[in-house]
């Protein structure tokens, strides 16, 4: 039974040209995290593998930095970075948990600082079924 929940930074806004930290936290489970995938819509941004370390997708190599922790730092933000981001936690023995973050990149005069809040997102909708695509779970 999957008991864990994913807490995320929720809906966040940031300034164009600035940077932002995408952060998820898995709690209420003793499952071992084996890999975390960070995705934007259907595009892979990065992988953090417990055994092998980080992989940053080449199309983001100049603008994405690993960390802090299992999080991801997006730099040199553009308006095109606005959208949904997903942290997909692969765990053993629980299976897969998915968290969602919505990022809005605004012109610097409009962006609100400190507009971060946490939305717990439960990851109980599916088990470790490799044939299912994570984005079916919003």
């Amino acid at each position: 039974m999957m008991t864990g929940t994913i807490e995320t930074t929720g809906n966040i806004s940031a300034e164009k040209g600035g940077s932002i930290i995408l952060q998820c936290h898995l709690s209420s489970t003793t499952a071992q995290v084996t890999q975390v995938n960070w995705e934007q819509q259907d595009q892979l941004l990065a992988i953090c593998n417990a055994d092998l370390g980080w992989h940053i997708s080449p199309s983001f190599k100049d603008r994405v930095a690993p960390g802090p922790g299992l999080g991801l730092t997006l730099q040199s933000l553009t308006v095109n970075d606005t959208g949904e981001y997903f942290c997909i936690y692969h765990t053993y023995p629980d299976g897969t948990y998915t968290g969602r973050i919505f990022l809005e990149v605004l012109e610097s005069s409009v962006a609100e600082h400190g507009a971060r809040f946490q939305i717990p997102i439960e990851g109980r909708d599916y088990k470790d079924d490799d044939d299912k695509h994570h984005h079916h779970h919003h």
Epitope: N49, D51, P58, D130
Partner: antibody, heavy 121, light 106 residues
Framework: EVQLVESGGGLVKPGGSLRLSCAAS????????MSWVRQAPGKGLEWVGR??????????DYAAPVKGRFTISRDDSKDTLYLLMNSLKTEDTAVYYC????????????WGQGTLVTVSS | SYELTQPPSVSVSPGQTASITCSGD??????GCWYQQKPGQSPILVIY???KRPSGIPERFSGSNSGNTATLTISGTQAMDEADYYC?????????FGGGTKLTVL
């Protein structure tokens, strides 16, 4: 020590089929993205296709010349990669290598010796 | 289809610096990798993710990738570096190899 051992090559007639295997050891195979690369006699390297880890969807990508004819699969419980080749053509004659995609700093390794596939009537 | 272009051959004197280029449309948006292959042997990865060296590869091998060009640089080239070198464009959807460059150490 990372090791890849390819097998299953041989002589096959045009239009025939062959299945290659690659036995992996010395690393966590299930997390690796794996590719097949071939090299025709006296020619350069040509990427055939890849399969991602199950934790990245386990999806496959193929080069245009083999798409629809070749199928890559993996058995993580056996640490083995496969390449099923159907409708073989003479131009598929090559040494076939299985390789680890260079995703992670902690997982780069040597290629195997390859297995020779000869398509001839 | 995506293509990578390498010079067929490059010559260098021992101790000098050899540079092998690889060009492709927006190659800098992908990862550039380089492989060394000596006659009768399997290829060896010498540079991955543009500029990283696998363990066991000498420091004289370095790489860069920007714009439309990736470059493999061998400083203080040695006779043992004579080989074919292949560039590779890598991303999460496809992989492409260049045609190869024969490096001759005069």
């Amino acid at each position: 020590e990372v090791q890849l051992v390819e097998s299953g090559g041989g002589l096959v007639k045009p239009g025939g089929s062959l299945r290659l295997s690659c036995a992996a050891s010395g690393f966590t195979f299930s997390y690796a993205w794996m590719s097949w690369v071939r090299q025709a006699p006296g020619k350069g390297l040509e990427w055939v296709g890849r399969i991602k880890s199950k934790t990245n969807g386990g999806t496959t990508d193929y080069a245009a010349p083999v798409k629809g004819r070749f199928t890559i699969s993996r058995d993580d419980s056996k640490d083995t990669l496969y390449l099923l080749m159907n409708s073989l053509k003479t131009e598929d004659t090559a040494v076939y290598y299985c390789t680890i995609d260079p995703l992670y700093d902690l997982l780069t390794g040597p290629w195997g010796q390859g297995t020779l596939v000869t398509v001839s009537s | 289809s995506y293509e990578l272009t390498q010079p067929p051959s490059v010559s260098v004197s021992p101790g000098q610096t050899a540079s092998i280029t690889c060009s492709g449309d927006k190659l800098g948006d992908k990862y550039g990798c380089w492989y060394q292959q000596k006659p009768g042997q399997s290829p060896i990865l010498v540079i991955y993710q543009d500029s990283k060296r696998p363990s066991g590869i000498p420091e004289r091998f370095s790489g860069s990738n920007s714009g439309n060009t990736a470059t493999l640089t061998i400083s203080g080239t040695q006779a043992m570096d004579e080989a074919d070198y292949y560039c590779q464009a890598w991303d999460s959807s496809t992989v492409v190899f260049g045609g190869g460059t024969k490096l001759t150490v005069l």
